[in-house]
Amino acid sequence: FERTRSLQDPCSNCPAGTFCDNNRNQICSPCPPNSFSSAGGQRTCDICRQCKGVFRTRKECSSTSNAECDCTPGFHCLGAGCSMCEQDCKQGQELTKKGCKDCCFGTFNDQKRGICRPWTNCSLDGKSVLVNGTKERDVVCGPSPADLSPGASSVTPPAPAREPGHSPQ
């Protein structure tokens, strides 16, 4: 099959790093400077991505693979293949159209990116707040209030041993 395919389409023989050159009777030509083809059988080479401005080069372009970019300090990648750079904020902040803003009371953000999220509602799990939340940290939930009532023990006593043949009452 491979031999049949290559007889039908000479371009299928062109390896990565080359293109099938129509100007040269479909012979394989190496990719021109600052371009690449990462797979065989290509009819053109793609222009290398250039990491400019807020982008910086993480991996140089070669004749067989594109450049890879990341973001300069103070920014982080968004999108597939770091297609955008977004400004970092401090912990306890979120990025809005007007820049970095502190998290509203009752919300937190423990990262330099993303949005402020509501504190955990401990009471939904029947628990109490052990450590209060801040703009940078979620609350820490502790035992339920009932567990902390006077005389209550946090240690569960062992179940009484059962005698064989007796069913529980």
Partner: nanobody
Framework: AVQLVESGGGLVQPGGSLRLSCAAS????????MSWYRQAPGKQRDLVAW???????HYGDSAKGRFTISRDNTKKTWYLQMNSLKLEDTAVYYC?????WGQGTQVTVSS
């Protein structure tokens, strides 16, 4: 423009070796890519080996593990070292850079 002249071809037995040379003259600073092609009678010109613009050597399937492309900048010369030659390596070998082609050198592998 760049002028290219190949040499080093000849008759060799199967399993033998040859080293082809490609001497460049003219504006050789324009050379970013250098390639070796070969053309057997009645066949299409085939890319054998090349040094890409990123200075990495690449090889076509027919050359992998047997041929080595290299250059000597002081002599403005590119080489194709061909080992373990086979009957099917018989062809005219050309060096190429951009629109510049050499006149070709004949390699014949025969017992």
């Amino acid at each position: 423009a760049v002028q290219l002249v190949e040499s080093g071809g000849g008759l060799v037995q199967p399993g033998g070796s040859l080293r082809l040379s490609c001497a460049a003259s003219g504006n050789i600073f324009d050379i970013r890519i250098m390639s070796w092609y070969r053309q057997a009678p009645g066949k299409q010109r085939d890319l054998v080996a090349w040094i890409a613009w990123d200075n990495v050597a690449h090889y076509g399937d027919s050359a992998k593990g047997r041929f080595t492309i290299s250059r000597d900048n002081t002599k403005k010369t590119w080489y194709l070292q061909m080992n373990s030659l086979k009957l099917e390596d018989t062809a005219v070998y050309y060096c190429n850079s951009g629109d510049s082609w050499g006149q070709g050198t004949q390699v014949t592998v025969s017992s």
